[in-house]
């Protein structure tokens, strides 16, 4: 009757292997670093390195973890219960509304403008007008001033999903 | 690949009912319990209901609990909610999800999802 996920379903490596330690759900859910399996009574514990969970669930597989692409430094390992964090390697940075590369920074602000902030993993440089101190949108300028600057020291890192 | 398709919001008048479905599109929902939130503009999703597919049992915000039912099919894996006796205060764009996410198990109510559908639009006017 139940139309739930078979382990043949999963990829290989997310199959439910004899040697993953088993414990009992609590309330119906299992902890962080565990996936339910199908008839709701075990918690099969997540791959270190492949797969993770991060809150109490009731998942019928861990979630893959992801790889940082080229042109990213793995700041943190995937481990059972976090994911891999990933961030922009220098010089480079990830915007909000396009998470899924990274971008070149700019090296030098138009004329008119000066810098006020550093290229980071997360921003780009940013410039605003000499005199009204109005932000520059961020487009790249037609024109650009000899000032460059160097990337800035991260802060923070940028945790992406997978 | 886990994917949620919600259908069945639309417009309606205080005191009228609307029944949601959800239906995965995948051959799995991913996860044993499914459930349903909501938004309004400039508000975090809010928890409504949610139902475990193996045995039944439900769950429910105190906000809808005697006025919204969850229910599931299997054979056609599909989650359904029957809203009645609807409020304005009940327009907003509904969200199923799967993967339950909480901070202890023994949480009633989920702080999030690992999967989302796409949403429906629910209003209801006085």
């Known amino acids: 009757e139940s139309a739930l996920i078979t382990q043949q379903d999963l990829a290989p490596q997310q199959r439910a292997a004899p040697q993953q330690k088993r414990s009992s759900p609590s309330e119906g859910l299992c902890p962080p670093g565990h996936h339910i399996s199908e008839d709701g009574r075990d918690c099969i514990s997540c791959k270190y390195g492949q797969d993770y969970s991060t809150h109490w669930n009731d998942l019928l597989f861990c979630l893959r973890c992801t790889r940082c692409d080229s042109g990213e430094v793995e700041l943190s390992p995937c481990t059972t219960t976090r994911n891999t964090v990933c961030q922009c390697e220098e010089g480079t940075f990830r915007e909000e509304d396009s998470p899924e590369m990274c971008r070149k920074c700019r090296t030098g602000c138009p004329r008119g403008m000066v810098k006020v902030g550093d290229c980071t993993p997360w921003s780009d440089i940013e410039c605003v007008h000499k005199e009204s101190g109005t932000k520059h949108s961020g487009e790249v300028p037609a024109v650009e001033e000899t000032v460059t600057s160097s990337p800035g020291t991260p802060a923070s890192p940028c945790s992406l999903s997978g | 690949e886990v994917q949620l398709v919600e259908s069945g919001g639309g417009s309606v008048q205080a005191g009228d009912s609307l029944r949601l479905s959800c239906a995965a599109s995948g051959r799995t929902f991913g996860s044993i319990r499914v459930g349903w939130f909501r938004q309004t503009p400039g508000k975090e999703r809010e928890f409504v209901a949610a139902?475990?597919?193996?045995?039944?049992?439900?769950y429910y915000a105190d906000s809808v609990k005697g006025r919204f039912t969850i229910s599931r099919d299997n054979a056609k894996n599909t989650v359904y909610m029957q809203m009645a006796s609807l409020k304005p205060e009940d327009t907003a764009v509904y969200y199923c999800a799967a993967g339950l996410q909480y901070n202890r198990s023994a949480d009633r109510v989920p702080v999030g999802a690992v999967y989302w559908g796409q949403g429906t639009q629910v209003t209801v006017s006085s």
């Open positions: 139902i475990n597919r193996n045995d039944g049992t439900t």
